[in-house]
């Protein structure tokens, strides 16, 4: 899976697992680099059976409902150096029982686009700006929908922003 994010935005790398029984959490690690034989290379965040037990910086946090198996990694205010493969490793107890997910994060330079001129009394086809409160660093996260041909860079039909169990879907309609 590939995720494309602009410099300065927050990146969200999804990872989920199903709990055997409610509250029966499983240790998870997130690391930079493809999943190695065990653990995660260059760990950026780790959970134990209760909570986040380690993270290298406050730029990393879990964005979903961790207690329901949503261990989506959020990376705040991304830079070009954040590009690369990330490993989500769900350490399901047992012999060689881990679930491993490699996700590719591509960081693009921030794009400066002039705001389109709209005729007076008209409204955009859909909101140009969506703002959601975020449970990572205390900040407001802003997602701008771009109306240009580079929209094809977005590889998925719907980007999901997860905020404490609430899912907001922004559907991108391709106009060429």
């Amino acid at each position: 899976e590939e995720y494309i994010v602009e410099v300065g935005q927050n990146a969200y790398l999804p990872c989920f697992y199903t709990l055997d029984t409610p509250g029966n959490l499983v240790p998870v690690c997130w690391g930079k680099g493809a999943c190695p034989v065990f653990e995660c290379g260059d760990v950026v965040l780790r959970t134990d059976e209760r909570d986040v037990s380690y993270r290298t910086s406050s730029r990393y946090w879990l964005n979903g409902d961790f207690h329901k198996g949503n261990v989506t990694l959020a990376i705040g205010n991304v830079t070009l150096e954040d590009s690369g493969i990330y490993c989500c490793r769900v350490q399901i107890p047992g012999i060689m029982n881990d679930k491993k997910f490699n996700l590719k994060l591509v960081i693009k330079p921030a794009k400066v686009t002039p705001a389109p001129t709209l005729p007076r009394d008209s409204t955009p086809a859909f909101p140009r700006m969506l703002t959601t409160e975020d449970h990572g660093p205390a900040e407001t996260q802003t997602l701008e929908i771009l109306h240009d041909k580079n929209l094809t860079q977005l590889s998925t039909l719907a980007n999901e922003l997860q905020d404490a169990g609430t899912t907001i879907r922004i559907h991108h309609h391709h106009h060429h």
């Epitope: 240790p27 493809a34 034989v37 653990e39 134990d48 059976e49 350490q91």
Partner: antibody, heavy 117, light 109 residues
């Protein structure tokens, strides 16, 4: 200073059992995966088993799967290897190693296991 | 997974450079940046010299360097010294931990 001290090796008959221990100090034991690596006399290195930070996930080489069991006690900073149904080809020096994510940055001095009748 | 392939031995004079190769497949060496190198003196425990293909742990002299091309990883010792005489093992740690058969480095003279 990181120290890993193995114990529990010795002479055992084929089919017998042995339990190796590794006492760790000088680092936060509960924050690292741990592993066992062995070396038969005059031969190269062979990875045997590893265990995750929490101890819930374990990993084994095909040659020992079903016979060996790795475990850890984070409260005692100790790693274990329970070896059952031992064979002559299990004869080796067994090293305890701090495993990170697959490379071993600290090793003990090893304990010799000899399987012979 | 079968063992990685290393030359049985290499030699060089003090001050020279020697390179040890370690050949695997696209599933291990070629597919990931997960290769390590260990030095082992007779009767001693192995010592980590390189990890993640080219990273050097603190305390390892910068005469030791690692690289990779395709399915082959290499360890280069530049400015060979007498104490470098030892066995060297490569290892891959992508899907499983696999070691090479080992290379004996001899310092001539």
């Amino acid at each position: 200073e990181v120290q890993l001290v193995e114990s529990g090796g010795g002479l055992v008959q084929p089919g017998g059992s042995l339990r190796l221990s590794c006492a760790a100090s000088g680092f936060t034991f509960s924050s690292y995966a741990m592993s066992w690596v062995r070396q038969a006399p005059g031969k190269g290195l062979e990875w045997v088993s590893a265990i995750s930070v929490s101890g819930g996930s374990t990993y084994y080489a095909d040659s020992v799967k079903g016979r060996f069991t790795i475990s850890r006690d984070n409260s005692k900073n100790t790693l274990y290897l329970q070896m059952n149904s031992l064979r002559a080809e299990d004869t080796a020096v067994y090293y305890c190693a701090k495993a990170n994510w697959g490379f071993f940055d600290y090793w003990g001095q090893g304990t010799l296991v000899t399987v012979s009748s | 997974q079968s063992a990685l392939t290393q030359p049985r031995s290499v030699s060089g004079s003090p001050g020279q450079s020697v390179t040890i190769s370690c050949t695997g497949t696209s599933s291990d060496v070629g597919g990931y940046n997960y290769v390590s190198w260990y030095q082992q003196h007779p009767g001693k425990a192995p010592k980590l010299m390189i990890y993640d293909v080219s990273k050097r742990p603190s305390g390892v002299p910068d005469r030791f360097s690692g690289s990779k091309s395709g399915n082959t990883a290499s360890l280069t010792i530049s400015g060979l010294q007498a104490e470098d005489e030892a066995d060297y093992y490569c290892s891959s740690y992508a899907d499983s931990v696999v070691f090479g058969g080992g290379t004996k480095v001899t310092v001539l003279g």
